[in-house]
Interface confidence: medium
């Protein structure tokens, strides 16, 4: 079910299936900033909270992924959806909750022994005839299974920030994604004028660390819009 993602989890790079399939309407949606209870194509929000829009998985929390929530799939509207539990259908690793990954279209435990004991008792998962690769992922980026057991250090290849050790995030570097340090106070950060614009970056920066936000540097207020420098500053 996963399509080629060119070493990226960017949803916009996914061909039709995400459009055709969409996110699972029954899954809880991002509780930050709000809790949204989807019901097919109709959505009810709690306390007027809005769903958190996204362009790729990294914009969502570690227990979330980015997808279109409507059944039947309008890929143009994407929000953060709750990660999918073990034994649920998936299209890519980021959809599965931490400690699981997407194997043959099903979220399975990273602990292979656990997987064999529970899943294979009830479902036989087989590889596709002509499109599957050795690891059972259809035309997808292959990564060492080790990354699902140990947190990646700086420079390690990753799929999402939860794959990286504490203090690191998963960010694009050329055409792959690696663990990079979360930004500290005073470090230059990237402020995106519109959601998803950083999907075009070849060298993606991490987000600002806890208690910090990416704001225009005070002495740059007078500069032209295009040259404004943003740094991580205390709230």
């Amino acid at each position: 079910t996963l399509n080629s993602v060119l070493n990226s989890n960017a949803i916009k790079n996914l061909p039709p299936p995400l459009g055709g399939a969409a996110g699972h309407p029954g899954s809880a949606v991002s509780a930050a900033p709000g809790i949204l209870y989807p019901g097919g194509n109709k959505y009810q929000t709690i306390d007027n909270y809005q769903p958190y829009p996204c362009a790729e998985d990294e914009e969502c929390g570690t227990d979330e992924y980015c997808a279109s929530p409507t059944r039947g799939g309008d890929a143009g509207v994407q929000i953060c959806l709750a990660c999918r539990k073990r034994r649920k259908r998936c299209m890519r690793h980021a959809m599965c909750c931490p400690g699981n990954y997407c194997k043959n279209g099903i979220c399975v435990s990273s602990d292979q022994n656990h997987f064999r004991g529970e899943i294979e008792e009830t479902i036989t998962e087989s590889f596709g005839n002509d499109h599957s690769t050795l690891d059972g992922y259809s035309r997808r980026t292959t990564l060492s299974s080790k990354m699902y057991h140990t947190k990646g250090q700086e420079g390690s290849v990753c799929l999402r920030s939860s794959d990286c050790a504490s203090g690191l995030c998963c960010a694009r570097h050329f055409w792959s994604k690696i663990c990079k340090p979360v930004l500290k106070e005073g470090q230059v950060c990237t402020k995106h004028r519109r959601k998803g614009s950083h999907g075009l970056e070849i060298f993606q920066r991490c987000y600002c660390g806890e208690g910090l936000s990416c704001r225009i540097q005070k002495d740059h207020h007078q500069a032209s819009n295009s040259s404004r420098l943003h740094t991580c500053q205390r709230h």
Epitope: A21, G26, G128, G136
Partner: antibody
């Protein structure tokens, strides 16, 4: 319109195999899973497994493990379900049904294919 | 595996009656439940998805409710064309499981 059209009725002998086809039209075949469900006369619905036409990935119910094979030919938008080592209790109507990837609501069904296993 | 238990297995009601069918899951399935209608000799038809959402084109007299392990399917005012067998189906995780069905007939 969106529809799934299945192959015709089959009569098979015990031990033989049967291959049922399910042709999709009216939507992008690779964008939805195909599930197979069977129903013996006067009985309830029994889920056999799913196939993702895009990747060819499949998941089978344990009961059918080793006997069922789900395949597809994307060039003709057709899914296939082959059941081998047939026995009399496999006599049933076999349905293909479309579901989207995560929500397993079967919103489009084939008309059903009757498979009779008799010596 | 998750087992789905429907009750009653059959029921008889009059046109205009309110009809209720229940479905119980052997473990918590959140709202990952669908309801189907199957008329004799026909393929099933999806009526309700995600426990309470009406599928497009399905009359509003059909409704569903519940979450966790207990679910209810209701026909607010039974019509002659509603005579069929109704099935619940869980998709909380694989393998998918259907209830054994509830046969509905007119008195």
């Amino acid at each position: 319109q969106v529809q799934l059209v299945q192959s015709g009725a089959e009569v098979k002998k015990p031990g033989a195999s049967v291959k049922v086809s399910c042709k999709a039209s009216g939507y992008t075949f690779t964008s939805y899973d195909i599930n197979w469900v069977r129903q013996a006369t006067g009985q309830g619905l029994e889920w056999m497994g799913w196939m993702d036409p895009n990747s060819g990935n499949t998941g089978y119910a344990q009961k059918f493990q080793g006997r069922v094979t789900m395949t597809r030919n994307t060039s003709i938008s057709t899914a296939f379900m082959e059941l081998s080592s047939l026995r009399s209790e496999d006599t049933a109507v076999y349905y293909c049904a479309r579901t989207d990837y995560f929500y397993f609501g079967m919103d489009v069904w084939g008309q059903g294919t009757t498979v009779t296993v008799s010596s | 595996d998750i087992q789905m238990t429907q009750s009653p297995s059959s029921l008889s009601a009059s046109v205009g009656d309110r009809v209720t069918i229940t479905c119980q899951a052997s473990q918590d399935i959140s709202k990952d439940l669908n309801w189907y209608q199957q008329k004799p000799g026909k393929a099933p038809r999806l009526l309700i998805y995600d426990a309470s959402n009406l599928e497009t084109g399905v009359p509003s007299r059909f409704s569903g409710s519940g979450s966790g392990t207990d679910f209810t399917f209701t026909i607010s005012s039974l019509q002659p064309e509603d005579i069929a067998t109704f099935y619940c189906q869980q998709y909380d995780h694989l393998p998918i499981a259907f209830g054994q069905g509830t046969r509905l007939e007119i008195k």
